[in-house]
């Protein structure tokens, strides 16, 4: 159940896909990855106001309980709903290999 | 890759399963659910310090970039890794039915 996609906080403030440019050094990968030298990392950032992109029933419950007990129950959180695969050229004991990672780049986002 | 399960912030402070008691009224379910009257809602609450219960490569990236750009990139977030099913006795147009929900109660937690 992907609930409302309208952000009541204003354009771009709610949970959505952002791109952050990061070097191998930024990611702590310089010692085991050869390429790419820089990654356009897609990640989920933004607020999750009431029922915005609620991933499931659990997210709806969390919203209700956060409204009641904000100090105890946190609001839902903006996380990846799915991922885009990515390859890395990585160092091995004997040389290099091309490895695919399925859980590295966010493809779309929801609140949970 | 479920990384370290040791919480550097002290016992119980990091991402883990919590139980919150909630009534049908608390949940906004009173108009469509008959039973149970009260639910022991299990949810994921707590901090996600560096590499604690990192769900995947994306969570590890998020940790690294949060350390570099804390104002831009949020820390990973504590969310359900899996769910326990739950049945609800709910009202229907013609009476009641027993419905199973697979995404209602968190079973265990990770950081993403």
């Amino acid at each position: 159940a992907r609930n409302g996609d309208h952000c009541p906080l204003g354009p771009g403030r709610c949970c959505r896909l952002h791109t952050v440019r990061a070097s191998l050094e930024d990611l702590g990968w310089a010692d085991w990855v050869l390429s790419p030298r820089e990654v356009q990392v897609t990640m989920c950032i933004g607020a999750c106001p009431s029922q915005f992109r609620a991933a499931n029933m659990h997210a709806q419950i969390k919203t209700s309980l956060h409204r009641l007990k904000p100090d105890t129950v946190p609001a839902p959180c903006c996380v990846p709903a799915s991922y885009n695969p990515m390859v890395l050229i990585q160092k091995t004991d004997t040389g290099v290999s091309l490895q695919t990672y399925d859980d590295l780049l966010a493809k779309d986002c929801h609140c949970i | 890759a479920r990384n370290g399960d040791h919480c550097p912030l002290g016992p119980g402070r990091c991402c883990r399963l919590h139980t919150v008691r909630a009534s049908l009224e608390d949940l906004g379910w009173a108009d469509w659910v008959l039973s149970p009257r009260e639910v022991q809602v299990t949810m994921c609450i707590g901090a996600c310090p560096s590499q604690f219960r990192a769900a995947n490569m994306h969570a590890q990236i998020k940790t690294s970039l949060h350390r570099l750009k804390p104002d831009t990139v949020p820390a990973p977030c504590c969310v359900p890794a899996s769910y326990n099913p739950m049945v609800l006795i709910q009202k229907t147009d013609t009476g009641v039915s027993l419905q199973t929900y697979d995404d209602l109660l968190a079973k265990d937690c990770h950081c993403i």
Partner: antibody, heavy 118, light 107 residues
């Protein structure tokens, strides 16, 4: 496993055009960092890189041949196409496609032969 | 475009010999040179990436070195299946360019 298969070769008239297909399996062209390139080899000669296309649809071409080449992809069909216009005798060659991961060309097809002759 | 000049263009050698091929780039390409092996009627096979890194499954008798403009490819002890044509290729910038090839043949 990764396989690539070129097709579309054969006899082409000078001044005509050729359209080659590269169908592949074992990888996806929607994966970040993946591309498909075309390389050719004239009879008894060395290798000449022609063009490549990336997962994000960025395209690069051999400088000398750029005006005659078009490269495109159909991600859902796992196919990449190379079109060459205004062909001449010196375009006679075996045309290979290769899988690319950034600047690695690690898997190659077996090639398709193009002969330009009247 | 960056020119890649390989030498020698051919060499005759025997099983067990050490073989060295050189490749010179027309401008600095850092370590961005790959090496390929091609047998008659077959597609090239990828051997070495970024001057010195053997690709997955490539035997350790194959090695590479160099940076800037001068690169070397070595087969430490030639095996019967190593008789082939070897190409260097710069992957520093597009258009990617190959050397003209070195044919390693039986003496």
């Amino acid at each position: 496993q990764v396989t690539l298969l070129e097709s579309g070769g054969g006899l082409v008239q000078p001044g005509g055009s050729l359209r080659l297909s590269c169908s592949f399996s074992g990888f996806s062209l929607s994966t970040y960092g993946i591309g498909v390139g075309w390389i050719r080899q004239a009879p008894g000669k060395g290798l000449e890189w022609l063009a490549h296309i990336w997962w994000n649809n960025n395209k690069y071409f051999n400088t000398a041949l750029k005006s005659r080449l078009t490269i495109s992809k159909d991600t859902s069909k796992n196919t990449v196409y190379l079109q060459m216009n205004s062909v001449r005798a010196e375009d006679t060659a075996v045309y290979y496609c290769a899988r690319m991961g950034y600047d690695i060309m690690d898997y190659w097809g077996q090639g398709t032969t193009v002969t330009v002759s009247s | 475009d960056i020119q890649m000049t390989q030498s020698p263009s051919s060499l005759s050698t025997s099983v067990g010999d050490r073989v060295t091929i050189t490749c010179k780039a027309s401008q600095d390409v850092n370590t961005a040179v790959a090496w390929y092996q091609q047998k008659p009627g077959k597609a090239p096979k990828f051997l070495i990436y970024s001057s010195s890194y053997r690709y997955t499954g490539v035997p350790d008798r194959f090695s590479g070195s160099g940076s800037g403009t001068d690169f070397t490819f070595t087969i430490s002890s030639l095996q019967p299946e190593d008789f082939a044509v070897y190409y260097c290729q710069q992957h520093y910038s597009t258009p990617w360019t190959f050397g003209q090839g070195t044919k390693v043949e039986i003496k």
